[in-house]
């Protein structure tokens, strides 16, 4: 868990965590922006979606993403058995039937069309590093977060609790 010796300490537990219900406990339609207020946008190009991080013009409409929140039981780190608590996992869908996926081999974030039940690569553990910011950690690769790299979304490894507050993995959600 964070705040102890580092991110890796809870790797096994995160892999073993299970979604407790097949339906989300809540859903939230919001625009996604970076800590520095750049917008996350989605563009259909050659029958596939591309994800961009960019400054929007003054009156340009922000793209919305449907965040679906799921509860996940978290096995205990302390005893190695039993349930230690619950996590919130989210899936992010900017358009019908498309979800953000973690491509751990390429360290990339991609949009894939898929049917439910969604694969583990589409689930991200939700974090609040700040009161008004969120971060998204890969369910399939603990310690790896969605982040911003070269004006694109990428997967970024975070190796200590101090680095959890680095701006490039912090995002803001807004209804407007």
């Amino acid at each position: 868990a964070f705040g102890i010796s580092g991110v890796q300490k809870y790797t096994r537990a995160l892999h073993d965590s299970s979604i407790t219900g097949i339906s989300p406990i809540t859903e939230y339609l919001a625009s996604l922006s970076t800590y520095n207020d750049q917008s996350i946008t989605f563009a259909l190009e050659d029958e596939s979606y591309e994800i961009y991080v960019e400054d929007l013009k003054k009156d340009e409409k922000k793209d919305k993403v449907l965040l679906s929140y799921y509860e996940s039981q978290h096995p205990s780190n302390e005893s190695g058995d039993g349930v230690d608590g619950k996590m919130l996992m989210v899936t992010l869908s900017p358009t019908k039937d498309f979800w953000l996926h973690a491509n751990n081999k390429e360290h990339s974030v991609e949009l894939h069309k898929c049917e439910k039940p969604l694969p583990d690569q589409a689930f991200f553990v939700l974090h609040n590093m700040h009161s008004n910011c969120v971060s998204f950690e890969c369910k399939t690769d603990p310690g790896v977060f969605i982040g911003v790299k070269d004006n694109h979304l990428a997967l970024i490894k975070v190796d200590s609790s101090e680095n959890l507050c680095t701006e490039n993995i912090l995002f803001k959600l807004s209804e407007t």
Epitope: F2, I4, Y10, T26, G85, N128, S131, S161
Partner: antibody
Framework: EVQLVESGGGLVQPGGSLRLSCAAS????????MYWVRQAPGKGLEWVAA????????YYPESVKGRFTISRDNAKNSLYLQMNSLRAEDTAVYYC??????????????WGQGTLVTVSS | DIQMTQSPSSLSASVGDRVTITCRAS??????LDWYQQKPGKAPKLLIY???NLQEGVPSRFSGSGSGTDFTLTISSLQPEDFATYYC????????FGGGTKVEIK
């Protein structure tokens, strides 16, 4: 079993200071947002302070900002509330509470039994 | 800061009654809202989270609804152990409680 046990309450004069403690057990303390909530005698609940799992950020309402400081020691599974420049209106039962989920600020899933702070001359 | 206004501040009801408590936020909070129950001399207990989800162990006679600024806690058939004070709580922007609703025996 999740347990939160507050201590440190008592009688203090106006302008004085007090430090409350909350001993946590039964869960991975370093992974949760933690809170202090108070309740004046015969009144409602008031959120007083919040702190992130790694203690990187802390938050307060205007009523206590600049006078109260929340902190935590993850190695000791302990939460603290340092209260300075105390006023009569700070008289209340102070509860320690834990977030419902790992890493997120949503919901106060577990509460301690509370400790009474009385500010009076 | 977001203000939470609860109504009524108190109500009298009988066992078996359907009870409704409302909470209004000063600005939209989506469904980032909980309901808590508190009995005299005891710590509050989480009943409903994210507006409508029942906390484990809470009887199904409790339900929550609403989104945006207006929320409702309903007790479908009041039981003797339900006489208590109920609070709403938002965590969309900062954190704040409603003033509470005391449910008393008629």
């Amino acid at each position: 079993e999740v347990q939160l046990v507050e201590s440190g309450g008592g009688l203090v004069q106006p302008g004085g200071s007090l430090r409350l403690s909350c001993a946590a057990s039964g869960f991975t303390f370093s992974s949760y947002w933690m809170y202090w909530v108070r309740q004046a005698p015969g009144k409602g609940l008031e959120w007083v302070a919040a702190i992130t799992p790694n203690a990187g950020e802390d938050y307060y309402p205007e009523s206590v900002k600049g006078r109260f400081t929340i902190s935590r020691d993850n190695a000791k599974n302990s939460l603290y509330l340092q209260m300075n420049s105390l006023r009569a209106e700070d008289t209340a039962v102070y509860y320690c509470a834990r977030g419902q989920y790992y890493y997120t600020k949503y919901s106060l899933g577990y509460w301690g039994q509370g400790t009474l702070v009385t500010v009076s001359s | 800061d977001i203000q939470m206004t609860q109504s009524p501040s108190s109500l009298s009801a009988s066992v078996g009654d359907r009870v409704t408590i409302t909470c209004r936020a000063s600005q939209p909070i989506h469904n980032h809202l909980d309901w808590y129950q508190q009995k005299p001399g005891k710590a509050p207990k989480l009943l409903i989270y994210f507006g409508k989800n029942l906390q484990e162990g809470v009887p199904s006679r409790f339900s929550g609804s609403g989104s945006g600024t207006d929320f409702t806690l309903t007790i479908s058939s009041l039981q003797p152990e339900d006489f208590a004070t109920y609070y709403c709580f938002q965590y969309k922007k900062g954190w704040s409680f409603g003033g509470g609703t005391k449910v008393e025996i008629k």
